[in-house]
């Protein structure tokens, strides 16, 4: 399931990587790819009891 990318800021935001908006850093091939090509179950804050929903990747992660 893919949705449009959203910006990610806050405690979990990493140091920025040189990806343009709507691209995400692929750790395995070490370059930027379309966020929709990667998949994630974005973790909820600690203490949440239901499974994390599947979301699109955040740019520049």
């Amino acid at each position: 399931m893919r949705r449009g990318p959203r910006s990610l800021r806050g405690r979990d935001a990493p140091a920025p990587t040189p990806c343009v908006p709507a691209e995400c850093f692929d750790l395995l091939v070490r370059h930027c790819v379309a966020c929709g090509l990667l998949r994630t179950a974005r973790p909820k804050p600690a203490g949440a009891s239901s499974p994390a929903p599947r979301t699109a990747l955040q740019p520049q992660e």
Epitope: M1, P14, L37, T40, L57, E61
Partner: antibody, heavy 118, light 113 residues
Framework: DVQLQESGPSLVKPSQTLSLTCSVT????????WNWIRKFPGNKLEYMGY???????YYNPSLKSRISITRDTSKNQFYLQLLSVTTEDTATYYC????????????WGAGTLVTVSS | DIVMTQTPLSLPVSLGDQASISCRSS???????????LHWYLQKPGQSPKLLIY???NRFSGVPDRFSGSGSGTDFTLKISRVEAEDLGVYFC??????????FGSGTKLEIK
């Protein structure tokens, strides 16, 4: 919910080929990285390799040229082949999906025990 | 490849006790992007591994707050503040910083004393 299920023979003879299928529901294998991991008796986990959204593959060098991972996007399945198996390949084999934001294995199959014995 | 050294291999505890598991990597797990991709999984008997902690100290969805992760660089610790029966199983640390290949610790079996 994404679900993975391994299938294939539970007994393989030495020198033969181990072939397993991972069937994915709830997500498309054209997105993300899809992996094979095995657990030996005694709890050691070994990462075997992946097939990516583009169909590119990575194989752990420890498996030399014995391993092949392929996919069929029309069936939403990916496959493991391990050639020339020995008793040392006896293990529980898992397929797993990789989270592409934090890079952990977020979904695993139940695992299938494969015994190599004559 | 990054070698993950986990201790102890076996950890007998009494229910209600605190448990601590150590994981050491052969190289720093700080990625060039600033993240440390060190994760903890629990494999309960008869089940596949399930994620507990991601990126050193973040509890995954649904994981009780008695589980906590800490550490930096090459040295990491998983603590269970009050062990419950449902916590029994094999705990693995894993790194995703220097990949591929992904590598795992040798596992720590948490069992009742």
């Amino acid at each position: 919910d994404v679900q993975l299920q391994e299938s294939g023979p539970s007994l393989v003879k030495p020198s033969q080929t181990l072939s397993l299928t991972c069937s994915v529901t709830g997500d498309s294998i054209t997105s993300g990285y899809w992996n094979w991991i095995r657990k030996f008796p005694g709890n050691k986990l070994e990462y075997m390799g992946y097939i990516s959204y583009s169909g590119s593959t990575y194989y752990n060098p420890s498996l030399k040229s014995r391993i092949s991972i392929t996919r069929d996007t029309s069936k939403n399945q990916f496959y493991l082949q391990l050639l020339s198996v020995t008793t040392e390949d006896t293990a529980t084999y898992y397929c797993a999906g990789l989270d592409g934001l934090y890079w952990y294995f977020d979904v695993w199959g139940a695992g299938t025990l494969v015994t190599v014995s004559s | 490849d990054i070698v993950m050294t986990q201790t102890p291999l076996s950890l007998p505890v009494s229910l209600g006790d605190q448990a601590s598991i150590s994981c050491r990597s052969s190289q720093s797990l700080v990625h060039s992007n600033g993240n440390t991709y060190l994760h903890w999984y629990l494999q309960k008997p008869g089940q596949s591994p399930k994620l507990l902690i991601y990126k050193v100290s973040n509890r995954f969805s649904g994981v009780p707050d008695r589980f906590s992760g800490s550490g930096s660089g090459t040295d990491f610790t998983l603590k269970i503040s009050r062990v419950e029966a449902e916590d029994l199983g094999v705990y693995f640390c894993s790194q995703s910083t220097h990949v591929p290949p992904f590598t795992f610790g040798s596992g720590t079996k948490l069992e009742i004393k």
